[in-house]
């Protein structure tokens, strides 16, 4: 028998520095977690103790903090090289800055293979990107070789900016011939490493003949055997065992997100490359693990540029940006309108001639807007200003919901109106009218939404049975502020870009902004 240790991360999302327990900014260092310096300590400890170790990343290193905003992926290549990652799969967020924003900082600078079997380049891009990412890679481990085959969510064109010269194929269809090719090379130990979410990971384990282990990402799935060490609730045991169509037991793993855990899986193979046993658990990277001093010093060196960036002007406002709780928790506020407009603008993807865009709607809990911005400071808006407005380090995500769920959400928005509570919704691409004289749960008297399948966008009444795409904070997608109906009834959820980054990009693009209160949210009394 031959034993392999797979160490794995996924959805790190720019958490190069240690974070608090909820993966936001580290405040009390003695209780902070993760970060590349701490990760390196643990990885090195395992490499020294065990003979056959692979360190793999299942995508979405890009996007999530000011590190990515400033360094644009150069930080990913640098620190992943320093940690000696053995391979990485492309995630959807690796395309956030377009194909060039992937090629130059990461693909050209990574000293390890970057993989995806289901992304095919065409046109002029094919020769430019040739060899910079691979469908699979054979890695030497001790005296053996291990094949790693990559995959990426085929939804990427709706979630990021891969352009028109990359085709995202069905994962299973694309993976099978590559695995077959590895078999012809006499590679009999094969790991599928990718970024399509836990459901697809399980399907790959079930359907792709020859895959021995699946290491996934995208869905931030936490798996654990035994008593979990922190706040995350396991979605299943680690590893999650799938019985393949040809009768094999295939371990599937994922390691939550944000570099909080290091996935740790031990696999025993027989001489023919069959998995005999698999066991392990994610390792919580808490403060009991010291940060490596040399990596930490490097982080501090790179940090300097971030502090300078925070105070630079992104753009100007010529109006007061009213982000006060007195406004945003009671009525339409122009800060809410600005943020929602930025959220929609960040999700412009012309992927179908029938649609002017794939999504037109935004909702945003008023309680998530934490500060106004005064225009009487020469109109200047900085990252620091925006961090005061959006201090929670969240993301603006894409969900699919039925109209009936949206109606419930808007009823919840005003079910206890007048108490300055955070659930009051700010909107974009939506016109809502409330009648507060009616009983809670029956106060939405008009709800019109902006069409997407139209050449001239206009507002039409919400249809209860229709499925709509909506951009919203991850806080709401996870049922925050009492929006349990969103969490329970959503049909799809893809995590998006860092909230501050979305707004800062929009302001930089617009240069001068002047959002108004324009009748998106209205109140009436009487009959309708």
């Amino acid at each position: 028998a031959w034993e392999l240790t797979i160490l794995h991360t996924n959805d790190v999302h720019s958490r190069l520095e240690q974070t608090s327990e909820d993966s936001s900014k580290c405040v009390n260092a003695s209780r902070c977690m993760g970060g590349v310096a701490r990760l390196f300590t643990k990885v090195q400890q395992i490499r020294r103790a065990e003979p056959n170790v692979l360190l793999l990343d299942a995508g979405d290193q890009y996007q999530g903090t000011i590190w990515f905003t400033v360094y644009k992926g150069a930080e990913v290549a640098h620190f992943m090289n320093a940690l000696r990652y053995d391979a990485m799969a492309l995630g959807n967020h690796e395309f956030d800055n377009g194909v060039e924003g992937l090629i130059e900082p990461l693909l050209k600078e990574a000293k390890f293979p970057i993989l995806s079997a289901n992304i095919k380049a065409k046109g002029p891009l094919a020769s430019q990107i040739s060899g910079l990412y691979l469908p699979y890679k054979v890695l030497p481990v001790g005296d053996e070789v291990v094949g790693i085959v990559g995959y990426t969510s085929k939804e990427t064109p709706f979630l990021s900016n891969p352009g028109t010269n990359l085709v995202f194929e069905d994962e299973i269809t694309a993976l099978q011939p590559e695995v077959d090719k590895l078999k012809t090379l006499n590679v009999n130990k094969i790991i599928a490493l990718g970024h399509s979410g836990f459901e697809m990971d399980k399907l790959i384990a079930q359907k792709v003949r020859g895959v021995d282990v699946v290491v996934g990402g995208h869905s931030n799935t936490f798996l654990y055997t035994g008593n979990p060490p922190s706040k995350e609730v396991p979605a299943g045991k680690y590893p999650f065992i799938v019985t393949s169509d040809d009768g094999r037991k295939v371990p599937v793993v994922q390691a939550y997100a944000f570099g909080k855990y290091l996935g740790y899986l031990k696999i025993e193979f027989d001489e023919r490359g069959n998995v005999i046993s698999s066991h392990g658990n994610p390792i919580l990277l808490n403060s009991s693990i010291p940060e490596d001093p040399s990596i930490k010093a490097d982080i501090n060196k790179w940090r300097i540029k971030l502090d300078n960036y925070s105070t630079q002007e992104l753009g100007k406002t010529i109006v007061y940006l009213d982000g006060s709780s007195q406004s945003c928790r009671f009525r339409e506020c122009n800060m809410g309108n600005l943020i929602c407009d930025a959220m929609i603008n960040n999700n412009l993807r012309h992927t179908d001639e029938m649609f002017w865009n794939h999504v037109s709607m935004c909702i945003l809990n008023g309680g998530g807007i934490r500060s106004p911005i005064d225009e009487r400071n020469n109109g200047t808006i900085t990252w620091e200003n925006l961090a005061a407005v959006l201090p929670f380090g969240g993301t603006f995500d894409l969900v699919q919901l039925k109209g009936s769920t949206l109606k419930k959400a808007f009823e919840h928005s005003v079910h206890r109106y007048g108490q300055s509570t955070g659930e009051f919704l700010q909107v974009g691409g939506i016109h809502v009218v409330y009648d507060l004289s009616r009983k809670p749960g029956d106060r939405v008297v008009k709800l019109d939404v902006l069409c997407t399948k139209c050449r001239v966008p206009s507002y039409d009444p919400l249809k209860m049975d229709e499925v709509y795409k909506v951009i919203l904070p991850n806080f709401l997608a996870n049922g925050g502020d009492g929006f349990q109906m969103i969490k329970d009834e959503l049909l799809r959820h893809d995590s998006g870009d860092q909230d501050i980054n979305v707004v800062s990009t929009y302001i930089s693009k617009m240069k001068v902004i002047y959002p108004a209160v324009e009748g998106r949210i209205k109140f009436s009394t009487g009959s309708h």
């Epitope: 990574a110 000293k111 890679k137 070789v145």
Partner: nanobody, 124 residues
Framework: QLQLVESGGGLVQPGGSLRLSCAAS????????IGWFRQAPGKEREGVSC????????YYADSVKGRFTISRDNAKNTVYLQMNSLKPEDTAVYYC?????????????????WGQGTLVTVSS
């Protein structure tokens, strides 16, 4: 496009020397391992030597240890294989191959990019 071109092959007498070159175009060699492989008529391709991208560590097959030396010149984007004390059993087509990783091995399957090969004949 990543391309590897071997040169320096030819006919040499037993005990003689040759220096093979592997020139890369379309990419810089810094982040790539380079391996030299050979295939004799009717035999499988086998690893001869490799040089890693990270520390420039070198590895040799037992059959060539002490006789062959691999080196790289990143400025010239070229890797060399100095072959001394050649034997008739060294006769083969020699290929260079590249792969992007820190560590090299003599496993054929590790390498993603291959040259067309250059023929080395050792005969009196």
């Amino acid at each position: 496009q990543l391309q590897l071109v071997e040169s320096g092959g030819g006919l040499v007498q037993p005990g003689g020397s040759l220096r093979l070159s592997c020139a890369a175009s379309g990419f810089t060699l810094d982040y790539y391992n380079i391996g030299w492989f050979r295939q004799a008529p009717g035999k499988e391709r086998e690893g001869v030597s490799c040089i890693s991208s990270s520390e420039g560590s070198t590895y040799y097959a037992d059959s060539v240890k002490g006789r062959f030396t691999i080196s790289r010149d990143n400025a010239k984007n070229t890797v060399y294989l100095q072959m001394n004390s050649l034997k008739p059993e060294d006769t083969a087509v020699y290929y260079c191959a590249a792969d992007r990783y820190y560590y090299c091995s003599l496993h054929v399957s590790q390498y993603d990019y291959w040259g067309q090969g250059t023929l080395v004949t050792v005969s009196s």
